[in-house]
């Protein structure tokens, strides 16, 4: 296994519907030809594997159907947008990225993401 | 620690076929990566000639396409080999091996290169 | 083939001074670049891949930066070691290509 270096946003604000996005970019030495991304997110020393997807280099990344994830990819770049997120949700989203194809197998793992959720005030009731 | 060292004759005649050999120590080419072959010419333009990867697949510069083979040796897969065909004195160059991650990448292990002159 | 444009082709500068060479690509590159030192009698060096990621071993001294199609290689507190030619090669696109060398000489 060798070692990569993965960089992400240190804080995110997820927007007032609940949606995040964040770039993972990973430093290769070479260009894979498959590559596998997956979100972790810790939480109070708890750490669980939000989604994940492996996706062939120049294609799109494809998330299962019942995924809060989707993303993109641009070379080394990899555009990474988590939905219906609620307030309990706020962590440290963690991207870690897999070179599975070549041969050798390359590991990174990025810092973290702080994402930070804050549910919308209910509308106040309306006379009209 | 890897290395790659470049073996072969100093000297070939112009029609001829130019075979030079990388003898790797420390890492097996079938494990992975992708095992090169670039050349420096005398006014230090460097070029990339073609590669193999761990799996036996060639990739080669379309300029030399139809001179170039790059193989393997099938029994320890601790070398790798070139032969270029009908050389001509613009062939002249110190011949380098290398390796790179991936299906093109930065090198990351070199040889100190073997030169080659090629005259009558 | 995508060009690699890398200038100057030589340079001189005092110890301990700070030098950048550029290279400009032909097209986008997606920060696929590396850049080598090479010295005679050797194999060239990878210093940096990825635009900007060190190589194991390469000191902090060396650092890249840029994107799209403009590179460049930094070196500061120059070091008699750093006598050397330096190139960038790009690996978007097969054929690998290199630019045309800088040659670093110490005033």
């Known amino acids: 296994c060798k070692a990569m270096h993965v960089a992400q946003p240190a804080v995110v604000l997820a927007s007032s519907r609940g949606i995040a996005s964040f770039v993972c970019e990973y430093a290769s030495p070479g260009k894979a030809t498959e590559v596998r991304v997956t979100v972790l997110r810790q939480a109070d020393s708890q750490v669980t594997e939000v989604c994940a997807a492996t996706y062939m280099m120049g294609n799109e990344l494809t998330f299962l159907d019942d995924s809060i994830c989707t993303g993109t990819s641009s070379g080394n770049q990899v555009n990474l947008t988590i939905q219906g997120l609620r307030a309990m949700d706020t962590g440290l989203y963690i991207c870690k990225v897999e070179l599975m194809y070549p041969p050798p197998y390359y590991l990174g793992i990025g810092n973290g993401t702080q994402i930070y959720v804050i549910d919308p005030e209910p509308c106040p009731d309306s006379d009209f | 620690d890897v290395q790659l060292q470049e073996s072969g004759p100093g000297l070939v005649k112009p029609s001829q076929s130019l075979s030079l050999t990388c003898s790797v120590t420390?890492?097996?080419?079938?494990?992975?990566?992708?095992w090169n072959w670039i050349r420096q010419f005398p006014g230090n333009k460097l070029e990339w000639m073609g590669h193999?990867?761990?799996?036996?697949?060639?990739?080669y510069n379309p300029s030399l396409i139809n001179r170039i083979s790059i193989t393997r040796d099938t029994s320890k897969f601790l070398q790798f080999f070139l032969k270029l065909s009908s050389v001509t004195t613009e062939d002249t160059a110190t011949y380098f091996c290398a390796r790179h991650y991936g299906s093109s990448g930065a090198m990351d292990y070199w040889g100190q290169g073997t030169s080659v002159t090629v005259s009558s | 083939d995508i060009q690699m444009t890398q200038s100057p082709s030589s340079l001189s500068a005092s110890l301990g001074g700070k030098v950048t060479i550029t290279c400009k690509a032909s097209?986008?590159?997606?920060?696929?670049i590396g850049w080598y030192q090479h010295k005679p009698g050797k194999g060239p060096r990878l210093l940096i891949y990825y635009t900007s990621t060190l190589q194991p071993g390469i000191p902090s001294r060396f650092s890249g930066s840029g994107s799209g199609r403009d590179y460049s290689l930094s070196i500061r507190n120059l070091e008699p070691e750093d006598i050397a030619t330096y190139y960038c090669q790009q690996y978007d696109n097969l054929p690998l290509t290199f630019g045309s060398g800088t040659k670093l000489e110490i005033k």
């Open positions: 097209q986008d590159i997606k920060k696929y």
């Open positions: 420390g890492y097996s080419i079938t494990s992975g990566f992708y």
């Open positions: 193999i990867s761990h799996d036996g697949r060639n990739n």
